[in-house]
């Protein structure tokens, strides 16, 4: 912390301007009031201060504002916003898009990870749902973020939003998050025929259930191995052979690469030698021929 | 040491069909899908299609999809292609090729010699 | 489908130069592309794959280069024997397409 000195007279701060970069750090925290520095926060990045000395403001900026700083501070920022801590953002209350567009820019190319999604977070809190604005702001500014969010705050996009989502802002995201978006896409893309249904629906898949997967093998839809890798494990587990023969099309002859990995590895172990043969590409690992499977987590549950 | 060994030579007539083998050895015949791939003269190489070995499904470029037809005789491991309404254009060389699934869906390590079907009246 | 652009068509270079062949795909192809060289009434012998792997017994001269959609086949010293059709194949998709190949001839 600055240690705290009066401020010389000639020294004293009416305005905020360029003056204030030769300013050593305990002139600025004597000399600068809070409350102009507030007042004045569409000025301070235009100043080259050093990060020492963005310090120094912030530190100002807590003290003034110690349950969190309003908008009209938050909006202008500019470079101080890379001296938040996710915890100062916490306390924040955001609601204007010109807000997050303009803290979006100034993060790009700094590891700010942490306080974008935290940021983003305060805007979905403050704006009550992730509506299409939104959607559409994140898209544009932070192609990505979208994943940054709690499966929690994900639950408030509506279905009408999910069509301004793009393939490349779903791949960071998890499969919690995409078992929260995939039941909306599924209602948002539910109008739209077999193949212009598959295209929209690859990216969410993720979180699709085993018998959405069962139905898609029905549909001629030729699932690529890279969206088939992506599935659940426990979608995949149930399906047959034919099911998956099916589903990929010529794709299939792609398992053969991930017969190793999951979920193609846990899903070998559990299909029958025989059947696994029927694929030409001696995938092995099946349930040898003759044998019984006995499920006995069933026999627990009942007992 | 795997081998494909192609059927000889044919020549045809324009509007009949021709029926090409590739007999494999050396390897587990029905653990890699074999494919077919031709080139016509002057022409660069162009893929016509595949098929599964083990239960003989086929998948064909969309360009000879309704004249081509792709077998396997997994008895004398042995694959065929056969290619109906020929044309003059049809005229060339026509390999088999098996796929080594290193990565992706695999790229092709194995040939074979080519046969050569000639399509004139 | 997965289109494969293969330029030059054909080229003449002296013994020693270095020849540089390019590929462009119709879309990204994740490295999944394999060099051929053609002679006539061979079969065609696989050189690269995975964009720079070269095969066992090939000579070091040959090599490759690329990401994405782009990809480059390079002869570091072109020797009489080089003489052939050069084809790329992309397998990133299990629809396999070749590149319209390159005649490489010694002036």
């Known amino acids: 912390d600055v240690e705290r000195t009066t401020c010389p007279p000639e020294k004293e701060v009416h305005e905020i301007d360029e003056s204030l970069i030769f300013y050593k750090k305990r002139e600025l925290e004597a000399c600068v009031d809070a409350a102009l520095l507030a007042a004045q926060m569409d000025r301070v990045d235009a100043i080259p201060f050093t990060y020492e000395q963005l310090d120094v403001l912030k530190h100002k900026l807590d003290e003034l504002y110690p349950q969190g700083y309003p908008e009209s501070v938050i909006r202008h920022l500019g470079h101080l916003f890379l001296k938040m801590s996710p915890e100062d953002i916490r306390k924040w209350n955001v609601t204007s898009l010109e807000t997050l567009k303009a803290l979006l820019k100034v993060s790009k190319g700094h590891e700010m990870s942490a306080q974008v999604a935290t940021l983003i977070d305060r805007v979905v809190v403050g704006r009550g749902q992730l509506d299409k604005d939104t959607v559409d702001t994140l898209t544009a500014f932070c192609p990505g973020c979208l994943c940054s969010l709690s499966p929690e705050r994900l639950s408030s996009v509506p279905p009408s939003v999910i069509g301004a989502v793009r393939p490349q802002d779903l791949d960071t995201c998890g499969p919690r998050q995409l078992d929260v978006l995939y039941p909306k896409a599924r209602l948002a893309f539910q109008n739209m025929s077999g193949s212009e249904y598959f295209v929209k629906i690859r990216p969410f898949l993720g979180g699709a259930p085993t018998e959405d997967v069962k139905a898609l093998s029905q549909q001629n839809v030729s699932m690529d191995l890279a969206t088939f890798m992506k599935l659940r494990r426990e979608a995949v587990l149930p399906l047959t052979v034919a099911e998956v023969q099916k589903l990929l099309g010529p794709h299939v002859e792609g398992l053969k690469v991930e017969e190793q990995h999951s979920p193609v590895r846990d899903w070998i172990l559990k299909q029958r030698q025989d059947d696994l043969d029927t694929l030409g590409l001696g995938l092995q690992g099946g349930i040898p021929n003759g044998y019984l499977i006995l499920d006995l987590s069933v026999r627990e549950a009942l007992s | 040491e795997v081998q494909l060994v192609q059927s000889g030579a044919e020549v045809k007539k324009p509007g009949a069909s021709v029926k090409v083998s590739c007999k494999a050895s050396g390897y587990t015949f029905t653990n890699y899908w074999m494919h077919w791939v031709r080139q016509a003269p002057g022409q660069g190489l162009e893929w016509m299609g595949n098929?599964?070995?083990?239960?003989?499904?086929?998948y064909y470029n969309e360009r000879f999809r309704s004249r081509v037809t792709m077998t396997v005789d997994k008895s004398t491991s042995t694959a065929y292609m056969e290619l109906s309404s020929l044309r003059s254009e049809d005229t060339a060389v026509y390999y088999c090729?098996?796929?080594?699934?290193?990565?992706?869906?695999?790229?092709?390590?194995?040939w074979g010699q080519g046969t050569t079907v000639t399509v004139s009246s | 489908d997965i289109q494969m652009t293969q330029s030059p068509s054909s080229l003449s270079a002296s013994v020693g130069d270095r020849v540089t062949i390019t590929c462009k795909a119709s879309?990204?192809?994740?490295?999944?592309i394999a060099w051929y060289q053609h002679k006539p009434g061979k079969a065609p012998k696989l050189l690269i794959h995975?964009?720079?792997e070269l095969q066992p017994g090939v000579p070091s001269r040959f090599s490759g280069s690329g990401s994405g959609r782009d990809y480059t086949f390079t002869i570091s010293s072109l020797q009489p024997e080089d003489i052939a059709t050069y084809y790329c194949?992309?397998?990133?998709?299990?629809?396999?397409?070749f590149g319209g190949g390159t005649k490489v001839e010694i002036k």
């Open positions: 090729a098996r796929p080594y699934y290193g990565s992706s869906y695999g790229y092709f390590d194995y």
């Open positions: 995975y964009t720079s």
């Open positions: 194949l992309q397998y990133a998709n299990p629809l396999r397409t």
């Open positions: 879309q990204d192809i994740n490295k999944y």
């Open positions: 098929i599964n070995p083990s239960q003989g499904g086929p």
